[in-house]
Amino acid sequence: TTPEPCELDDEDFRCVCNFSEPQPDWSEAFQCVSAVEVEIHAGGLNLEPFLKRVDADADPRQYADTVKALRVRRLTVGAAQVPAQLLVGALRVLAYSRLKELTLEDLKITGTMPPLPLEATGLALSSLRLRNVSWATGRSWLAELQQWLKPGLKVLSIAQAHSPAFSCEQVRAFPALTSLDLSDNPGLGERGLMAALCPHKFPAIQNLALRNTGMETPTGVCAALAAAGVQPHSLDLSHNSLRATVNPSAPRCMWSSALNSLNLSFAGLEQVPKGLPAKLRVLDLSCNRLNRAPQPDELPEVDNLTLDGNPFLVPGTALPHEGSMNSGVVPAC
């Protein structure tokens, strides 16, 4: 017997559907109507035939009461080929729901997204996460998607993007966006970062994550942030192969005074990089290749320093910096 494609937990909280059959019974997903967090994995199916079965141009207000009864707060949709028109139809209907967090992963969006009709209501998401989503429209995808969202988005995460740079002139500002995560785009690099951080479109960013994004030096990142007018409080550059030295011909970059937390863990560093901010509340240099304790003049003024997992740290060694957070035990790096 084939397993049921959808499983709802006994608390009506989590519902997971895995549609792996070539012609799945989509009605099975109705058991998820009472769930708060829903995951639907479509097994790589092409959802084009759906367009024949639904009227994508129908007024979504006719579904408003039905959709309002859904408890879903967080929805994950993955592994499918989705016509843009179908995606838009879903977003229009979900605008009447309580949905706050949407994750799209391993999707291929085909065709172009139509413009938002005047009477349409945008989807009031607080969080949008995209992983390995390709768009037929190339660089304009964010601008096209953005018009279907209300301006209150707080968290935007874009991983394994096929086009991590955006068409900046088409993108509107994200006035409420406090967290931007571009991690896991190894081809991004510092030039790509400059293209992705559309100037003055991200005025409220507090947390910027750039793990595994092909960054080369903290100074190069500083320059990209300065050019975009982005002033994060927290910056994560972990899991990049960072160079400690700065290109002597590169202009010196002044970090924003707003930055108080910098993560440089798992960055392959053999010495503390040059050109760090002068003052930080938190600096994480754990799991690097530091062969000696950093000298005070090599470090910023820092309240909370983590050096765990570096070769120079032998268990029982005195802590190398006042206020440091080392456990004395080398973690599994």
């Epitope: 937990d9 109507v33 967090e37």
Partner: antibody, heavy 115, light 111 residues
Framework: QLQLQESGPGLVKPSETLSLTCTVS?????????WNWIRQPPGKGLEWIGY???????SYNPSLKSRVTISRDTSKNQFSLKLSSVTAADTAVYYC????????WGQGTLVTVSS | EIVLTQSPATLSLSPGERATLSCRAS??????????LHWYQQKPGQAPRLLIY???NLQSGIPARFSGSGSRTDFTLTISSLEPEDVAVYYC?????????FGQGTKLEIK
Amino acid sequence: QLQLQESGPGLVKPSETLSLTCTVSGGSISSDSAWNWIRQPPGKGLEWIGYISYSGSTSYNPSLKSRVTISRDTSKNQFSLKLSSVTAADTAVYYCVRGLRFAYWGQGTLVTVSS
Amino acid sequence: EIVLTQSPATLSLSPGERATLSCRASESVDSYVNSFLHWYQQKPGQAPRLLIYRASNLQSGIPARFSGSGSRTDFTLTISSLEPEDVAVYYCQQSNEDPYTFGQGTKLEIK
């Protein structure tokens, strides 16, 4: 059998941050459900503060949202509450609770806000 | 937010009598076929204990004298034959939409 245990200081000064941790045994906080904080001022009713779900998603009571952070440490199977800028009105027994029908409760810890 | 109003505030009955506690919601707490309304018992110095979930389902380990009914906005907790150990405060709670809210409680006393 699932068990939840709150820990943290019993006395917090006004304007400071209240910090509590809930340690979960007999179940994983990252495999399912919502993991809540609920409080009860002395002699009063129950108030839901917020939750962090198995996925790391959070939801907060709008009346406290500007002051509350709920986070988790999956390696220790713990989740935590931080409530900033506390006043005497935040004096309460704080419970950690599993699910949205609250079937599993910690025994509660009294936090008094006083100088 | 959904406001839950419990009545009466205090209920005083004799052992063996039937207790009926009411909970009214300011808007429906139903989502399709389910009513996301739950009942709890709290004794002094203890954490609340779940009695009934989704309006009418008896939580494991709870005596069968407890039952629940209702849908949409009107719900009832019934204790068919009161025992002395049923002295407690009873709360209803909705989990249909956040913020998840509680009623103000009904105090059950034994004469």
